[in-house]
Amino acid sequence: YDFTNCDFEKIKAAYLSTISKDLITYMSGTKSTEFNNTVSCSNRPHCLTEIQSLTFNPTAGCASLAKEMFAMKTKAALAIWCPGYSETQINATQAMKKRRKRKVTTNKCLEQVSQLQGLWRRFNRPLLKQQ
């Protein structure tokens, strides 16, 4: 999906209002120094691409983020503020239902959510406004 035509300011507002708090809840009890941020993004569409990937794509050691509250709210925000996003996600959702597993908060998941917080921070405050 090409995130170029999303309403970035509306997504930012959704993040600041609710998603950020859910990420904090997920990370509660974890020190900010515990993980190094290795994932970066260069502009707002790129940040959303990386955010989508880390939030919804299962990775080795962390297969369960998509069912977390912050993930569901992220999905809702993208569906509302990114034209045509919902349609592209139908197949992905169906595939995800088939491999649903019980929720387990692993250290790998915590590290992944720490990366997500950095990506969202970058998305919210790109230094160059043409982004």
Epitope: A13, S32, T33, L119, R122, N124
Partner: antibody, heavy 120, light 111 residues
Framework: EVQLVQSGAEVKKPGSSVKVSCKAS????????MHWVRQAPGQGLEWIGA????????SYNQKFKDRATLTVDKSTRTAYMELSSLRSEDTAVYYC?????????????WGQGTTVTVSS | DIVLTQSPATLSLSPGERATLSCRAS??????????MHWYQQKPGQPPRLLLY???NLGSGIPARFSGSGSGTDFTLTISSLEPEDFAVYYC?????????FGQGTKLEIK
């Protein structure tokens, strides 16, 4: 807890340059915008610019665009602000400040300030 | 550039009194229903300290006697009952539009 420690006071001649450092300890360094703000004696706060350590991208107040250069060294978790062609009006306390956790644009961690005096 | 005008320039009050500080922006600092206006307190020889973010949210460790309100172009910082340590200079700051700008400050002094 995140701390920003700045380099010591500087006395410079008009026309010269000054380079102020700001070393971060604790927390994550690369994904927080780092800003520079100055305050002339008895005056208010003036934004100089910001840098994103992740890729070195910068944004400047137009007033300082030709004279200020912001850089970072990720390996030492240090941000730098260099100001060239100094004049007496540049006499001020220079602060580095880290942007907040969420990208809301406020500064929740500040350095202690570096006094730069420009005098012939 | 967005100009932030703070008033009054100096406010003389006694401990226990209520303080009301104003910050007016030359254009709206709102975006998608959020107000990107922040407030700081600065004491002599110290860096500024965050008081309130996004107009009305208390910064970490800030006492509940501080509160903020407003949207669009008009914002207010209120200190319900002044403590001796509250006498300082207060700055508003906007981040909605580059360049980031600060108000000129309001000095809160003991009467």
């Amino acid at each position: 807890e995140v701390q920003l420690v700045q380099s010591g006071a500087e006395v410079k001649k008009p026309g010269s340059s000054v380079k102020v450092s700001c070393k971060a300890s604790g927390g994550t360094f690369s994904t927080y915008n780092m800003h520079w703000v100055r305050q002339a004696p008895g005056q208010g706060l003036e934004w100089i610019g910001a840098i994103y350590p992740g890729n070195g991208e910068t944004s400047y107040n137009q007033k300082f665009k030709d004279r200020a250069t912001l850089t970072v060294d990720k390996s030492t978790r240090t941000a730098y602000m260099e100001l060239s062609s100094l004049r007496s009006e540049d006499t001020a306390v220079y602060y580095c400040a880290r942007e907040d956790d969420y990208g809301e644009g406020y500064f929740d961690v500040w350095g202690q300030g570096t006094t730069v005096t420009v005098s012939s | 550039d967005i100009v932030l005008t703070q008033s009054p320039a100096t406010l003389s009050l006694s401990p226990g009194e209520r303080a009301t500080l104003s910050c007016r922006a030359s254009e709206s600092v709102d975006n998608s229903g959020l107000s990107f206006m922040h407030w700081y307190q600065q004491k002599p020889g110290q860096p500024p300290r965050l008081l309130l973010y996004r107009a009305s949210n208390l910064g970490s460790g800030i006492p509940a006697r501080f509160s903020g309100s407003g949207s669009g172009t008009d914002f207010t910082l209120t200190i319900s009952s002044l403590e001796p340590e509250d006498f300082a200079v207060y700055y508003c700051q906007q981040i909605n539009t580059d360049p980031l700008t600060f108000g000129q400050g309001t000095k809160l002094e003991i009467k």
